[in-house]
């Protein structure tokens, strides 16, 4: 290299980060196969799990707000599983990146966009749940399977938004022992006059801004929306939480366990540029953090099965049926203050009361495009009990 | 060809401020981290001070802090240290270095010497 | 602040001989280190950096190693140019210090 030849400019950490070099220590290669071994298992089971979830939900149920929206969340941890795999590939060829600098942007942002979708959705139901019991009469007329795919579609829309600078900062570096790095550059595009204040300003308004907008921001919604529902339950005198209750909280505990740790890291991974005494804590914890937050895509679809009360005796019916008896809005099951009659006028709002893939109306957004993908969805779906009933009372 | 040229030392009496220059040529200036390091006679080296690239950050070690002042002018591509309440340990040939990229000095100045003495 | 001790201080050697100089920081310095060539009335030279990369222009028989605390500089067959005095810095977190040196005279 000639003496004037500028090399890539990296941020001080990341340069650090490039200067590790690999042990080939045995008992690190022992933790390395049994990371292979770990995240392989994962990515199958994410992938089945999920690919059920969404066969089943999206297919074999009659969709309903609630259905809607575990449907976009199942779709975006298949889409987070469907890039674990190639984590996975990183793992085994030695912790490098091999598969060239655009796909390690695609696999980065599957990555965040989960992130945010995950933390959005969550924030949506919440809120629908709770606009349910604060605002019953306005839910009853505007809570439609519609409305819910048009939300979650503004929501993808947001997480794509907010993805787009992880994107654009991702970039495969070459480390000096020869492995590549797939990691954030936010010198990449335009440095600025300084590098140390653009590393800087750039790595905390990205940790920060994950932090609020995918943790923070729909934890407190999820907090605040809880307070108002059990506020207004306490009022109406009713004691023991819905199915679909219980189904949330197990999400959301999930979210925060998963996602906490990641956005800790990353906070330190911000502050660690102008305190390099962090980076070694920071470079040790943040891919187990990391691989803590995709499992949470592999967690939620065993947990929509888990918080079925009695799971052990309808885990030997069908899938489908398991899932029904825990996705049923609380609404559906007689909210207190609500009537037979007015449940049934809502529920034929709210829900077709035939499965996604044979309603008589031509399925919209992403019901449509699932039914297009699943083509076996064409098949008269199975009517559980619980569709039986709906379809008798509001037909 | 890259080419560093200190000048401003001299003698100069304790408690007494001196101003280094060095002038950077055969590079894009505004595009490296910059160093001052120095070497007292017959001594090893030691690390002054350090600005970024644009001159928003500086460092120093505890021996300097708060005396010396490292600054820079890139249109000029030219490096400054300014040092108030010199003492006498301070007397040492003082070098500016290019940083190859955050660390590591690749390119020295011949260094100015700077005696303090009453 | 990060101690580094360089050993030996002064070595006699002859044209033709493997030369290893140690050099060993108070903590882990994570390869953040440069190895410096001084010859007398000279500025400095960087002959490695990050531990173990040879800086441009350098000759192949010099090569730097280690990690975490212990790091080496070794010239496996020394040169009448070789003869100087050699630094070792860290980079890890500031102030980067140097090493106290290692002058590696004629035998």
């Known amino acids: 290299m000639s003496a004037n030849a500028t090399l890539k400019p990296l941020c001080p950490i990341l340069e650090q980060m490039s200067r590790l070099q690999s042990h080939s220590n045995t008992s690190i290669r022992y933790i390395d196969h049994a990371a292979v071994l770990l995240h392989g298992l994962a990515s199958l089971l994410g992938l089945v799990e999920n690919g059920v979830i969404l066969f089943v939900v999206g297919c074999r149920m009659r969709q309903t707000v609630v259905t809607t929206w575990v449907l976009h969340l199942a779709l975006s941890d298949l889409l987070a599983s469907a890039s674990l795999p190639f984590f996975t590939y990183f793992l085994a060829v030695g912790h490098s990146w091999e598969l060239g600098t655009t796909f390690c942007k695609l696999h980065s942002s599957i990555f965040f966009l989960n992130m945010f979708a995950s933390g959005f959705l969550l924030s949506a139901i919440s809120l629908d749940r709770c606009l349910q019991v604060v605002r019953p009469v306005w839910a009853q007329n505007h809570r439609t399977v519609a409305a819910a795919h048009k939300v979650c579609l503004v929501l993808w829309a947001l997480a794509v938004l907010n993805t787009v600078p992880y994107f654009v900062f991702r970039d495969t570096i070459s480390r000096l022992d020869g492995r590549i790095m797939c990691y954030y550059n936010v010198l990449l595009l335009n440095p600025g006059p300084d590098r140390d204040a653009t590393c800087n300003s750039r790595q905390v308004a990205l940790a920060v801004s994950k932090f609020l907008l995918a943790f923070l921001v729909p934890l407190a919604i999820i907090a605040s929306s809880h307070a108002a529902v059990s506020l207004r339950l306490q009022h109406r005198g009713r004691r023991r939480p819905g199915r679909f209750v219980r189904l949330v909280a197990a999400v959301v505990a999930a979210f925060a366990l998963c996602w906490g740790p990641y956005h800790v890291f990353s906070l330190l991974e911000a502050r660690a540029h102008a305190n390099p005494g962090l980076r070694p804590l920071v470079w040790r914890g943040l891919p187990f953090v990391t691989s803590l937050a995709f499992f949470n895509s592999v967690a939620n679809p065993v947990l929509y099965v888990l918080t079925c009360p009695d799971m052990l005796r309808k885990l030997r019916r069908s899938l489908r049926t398991v899932l029904e008896s825990v996705l049923v809005d609380d609404s559906e099951l007689g909210g207190a203050g609500s009537s037979r009659r007015r449940r049934t006028s809502s529920t034929a709002r709210s829900a077709s009361p035939l499965a996604l893939c044979s309603r008589p109306e031509e399925p919209r957004g992403p019901a449509r495009l699932l039914g297009w993908l699943l083509g076996s969805c064409a098949a008269s779906p199975q009517t559980g009990p619980l569709n039986r009933a709906l379809s008798s009372t509001s037909s | 060809e890259v080419q560093l040229v200190e000048s401003g030392g001299g003698l100069v009496q304790p408690g007494g401020s001196l101003r280094l220059s060095c002038a950077a040529s055969?590079?894009?200036?505004?595009?490296?981290?910059m160093s001052w390091v120095r070497q007292a006679p017959g001594k090893g080296l030691e690390w002054v001070a350090r600005?970024?690239?644009?001159?928003?950050?500086?460092d120093y070690p505890g021996t300097v802090e708060g005396r010396f002042t490292i600054s820079r002018d890139n249109s000029k591509n030219t490096l400054y240290l300014q040092m108030n309440s010199l003492r006498a340990e301070d007397t040492a040939v003082y070098y500016c270095?290019?940083?190859?990229?955050?660390?590591?000095?690749?390119?020295w100045g011949q260094g100015t010497l700077v005696t303090v003495s009453s | 602040d990060i101690q580094m001790t360089q050993s030996p201080s002064s070595l006699s050697a002859s044209v033709g001989d493997r030369v290893t100089i140690t050099c060993r920081a108070s903590?882990?310095?994570?390869?953040?280190l440069a190895w410096y060539q001084q010859k007398p009335g000279k500025a400095p030279k960087l002959v490695v950096y990050?531990?173990?990369q040879l800086a441009d222009g350098v000759p192949s028989r010099f090569s730097g190693s280690g990690s975490g605390t212990d790091y080496t500089l070794t010239i496996s067959s020394l040169q009448p140019e070789d003869f100087a005095t050699y630094y070792c810095?860290?980079?890890?977190?500031?102030?980067?210090?140097f090493g106290q040196g290692t002058k590696v005279e004629i035998k």
């Open positions: 810095q860290h980079f890890w977190i500031t102030p980067w210090t």
């Open positions: 055969g590079f894009t200036f505004s595009f490296y981290l």
């Open positions: 600005i970024s690239n644009g001159g928003s950050t500086t």
């Open positions: 903590e882990n310095i994570y390869w953040n």
């Open positions: 270095a290019r940083h190859r990229t955050n660390w590591d000095f690749d390119y």
């Open positions: 990050a531990a173990t």
